[in-house]
Interface confidence: low
């Protein structure tokens, strides 16, 4: 019968001919009367056989990631009779893995959005690298993830590639972060290969800023001839948030005379001071009112940022108008 052990060839061998192993017939007494032949895909090009001894050699560098096994056939013939000594037999040469492939991130580019001020531990995104090496061969394809850029705001779980927040971030200070993740095979041991990817993490806005008046005092004037409903002037607050979180409503906080009103221009986010009752210079030539500003939408859990509404003082001077029939001699 045929005698052989399992055949293995390490991939990427640099030797011009690598001894794979030996197949022989147990009838072979070593007197050179038997001739061994190799058949099948790869015979003669990738693998050759010493016809006298049955020793098999690989004469090409092999790449396991391209082809991991070769199925060949062996024959043995008695030279003196020309007959087969054994029935033709099939055997397998396996290409064993070396760590020659670095991890690759396949889903690039990575981008994630997370609310600012998210607590530590909040999941941002999972990055996944794959390694073309053999997962069943040692640690060649066992990956460990680490953070190259992104501390102290982010962390990555070493075995899963899950990126989490490790420190609260304020969008108003910085609204996006580039995180760089490295995946290393060989579970990070010496000889490991690595791949890297960049993750763009954008912070979405939460309403953690209240609107604040630009000025603590505004001076406006109104003509005593102005009809009710007249726009006297505008006041303005700023809000470091964006979008809906920066929408604001202006209102009167204090106007003992009940002469003025404030409406909000939602397009410009300005407060418009309106004359509610006609004024009379001879009766009262100046007024002092206080206005306040609040965000339009505030979630319950964010109320702590909005406790004290910003206020401003508005001084309104009434302009005298010569009245018909007035004045005498």
């Amino acid at each position: 019968g045929w005698v052989w052990n399992q055949f293995f060839v390490p991939e990427e061998m640099n030797t011009t001919s690598h001894h794979v192993g030996r197949l022989r017939s147990d009838l072979d007494n070593g007197n050179n009367s038997f001739q061994y032949k190799l058949l099948g895909a790869g015979a003669g090009s990738t693998f050759i056989i010493d016809e006298r001894t049955g020793d098999i050699y690989a004469i090409e560098k092999l790449d396991r990631e391209e082809r991991s096994l070769y199925i060949l056939r062996a024959q043995v013939i008695d030279i003196t009779t020309g007959r087969a000594v054994e029935p033709e037999s099939e055997f397998v040469i396996k290409v064993s893995d070396i760590n020659d492939n670095e991890p690759k991130f396949l889903d690039e580019p990575y981008e994630a959005i997370v609310p600012e001020m998210s607590p530590e531990g909040t999941l941002v995104i999972q990055v996944t690298a794959s390694d073309a090496d053999d997962p069943s061969s040692g640690n060649n394809a066992r990956l460990l993830y680490s953070l190259l850029q992104g501390q102290p705001y982010f962390s990555v779980e070493p075995t899963t590639g899950v990126i989490r927040i490790s420190s609260k971030m304020d969008r108003e200070l910085q609204d996006e972060y580039w995180v760089i993740i490295q995946a290393k095979d060989m579970i990070g041991q010496p000889g490991a290969l690595s791949g890297t990817t960049s993750v763009l993490i954008k912070l979405s806005d939460v309403n953690d800023n209240k609107p604040i008046f630009k000025e603590s005092l505004y001076r406006l004037t109104v003509s005593e001839s102005a009809p009710t409903g007249t726009s006297i002037g505008t006041i303005m607050a700023y809000d470091n948030d964006i979008g809906e979180n920066a929408e604001m409503d202006y209102s009167i906080e204090e106007d003992d005379s009940q002469t003025f009103d404030i409406i909000t221009n939602h397009e410009t986010q300005e407060g418009i001071v309106i004359l509610k009752k006609k004024v009379n210079f001879e009766h009262q030539n100046h007024y002092g009112i206080r206005a306040k500003v609040k965000n339009h939408h505030v979630d319950e859990q964010l109320m702590k940022y909005h406790t004290e509404a910003s206020t401003t003082f508005i001084k309104i001077q009434v302009e005298d108008v010569d009245e018909p029939g007035g004045g005498g001699s």
Epitope: L148, Q149, I180, L193, S194, T196, S198
Partner: antibody
């Protein structure tokens, strides 16, 4: 926008020292490393060393160890590079270059360069 | 002698694709990101490619970078006359605990 503005050209005698400044603006000065890179006439780029403006920690290239000193002034967002015991082969354009928030990350902005000529 | 090896010169005609190589070792290219800089005559270097293959805003997508093992390359497709410059690769070296530059490649655009 980020800007690095370096001091003007210098002519020095062999054995003297030179101190080049690099004023940064348009970003948080203390968050990013700053490197110094030089280029002799007709030659390639040569890294000299790096400083982290936050703590002032420095790492110098082996070749310049003992001759180069990098410092910073956070109040003016300025880094300085002083090279002593000058010799004619130190004639070069000296650049400051902003690094990343980690030592091994790229230089994204460069100063305009300062020509230092060493001649007797 | 630079730690990173680049060809001293490269050339191509307008519209062509050229590749510039940068060869290092496990302690530099094998362990860290490769960056490429373009230096136009009489100007300071400019970041062209960072973290192996990323382009800063404003850099045309004609420029691309790649890295494999201990070597890296910069490819320029659709070559233009304004690409005539010196190109440098740079990487942080773990053994030297410092940055290393390639010797630079002078790219000539032939008319």
């Amino acid at each position: 926008q980020v800007q690095l503005v370096q001091s003007g050209a210098e002519v020095k005698k062999p054995g003297a020292s030179v101190k080049v400044s690099c004023k940064a603006s348009g970003y948080t000065f203390t968050s990013y490393y700053m490197s110094w890179v030089r280029q002799a006439p007709g030659q390639g780029l040569e890294w000299m060393g790096i400083i982290h403006p936050s703590g002032g920690d420095t790492t110098y290239a082996q070749k310049f160890q003992g001759r180069v000193t990098m410092t910073r002034d956070t109040s003016t967002s300025t880094v300085y590079m002083e090279l002593s015991s000058l010799r004619s082969e130190d004639t070069a354009v000296y650049y400051c270059a902003r690094g990343g928030i980690k030592l091994w990350l790229h230089f994204d902005y460069w100063g305009q360069g300062t020509l230092v000529t060493v001649s007797s | 002698q630079s730690v990173l090896t680049q060809p001293p010169s490269a050339s191509g005609t307008p519209g062509q694709r050229v590749t510039i190589s940068c060869s290092g070792s496990r302690s530099n290219i094998g362990s860290n990101f490769v960056n490429w800089y373009q230096q136009l005559p009489g100007t300071a270097p400019k970041l062209l490619i960072y973290t192996n293959n990323q382009r800063p805003s404003g850099v045309p997508d004609r420029f691309s970078g790649s890295k494999s093992g201990t070597s890296a390359s910069l490819a320029i497709s659709g070559l233009q006359s304004e690409d005539e410059a010196d190109y440098y690769c740079a990487v942080y070296d773990e053994s030297l605990q410092g940055w290393v530059f390639g010797g630079g490649t002078k790219l000539t655009v032939l008319s």
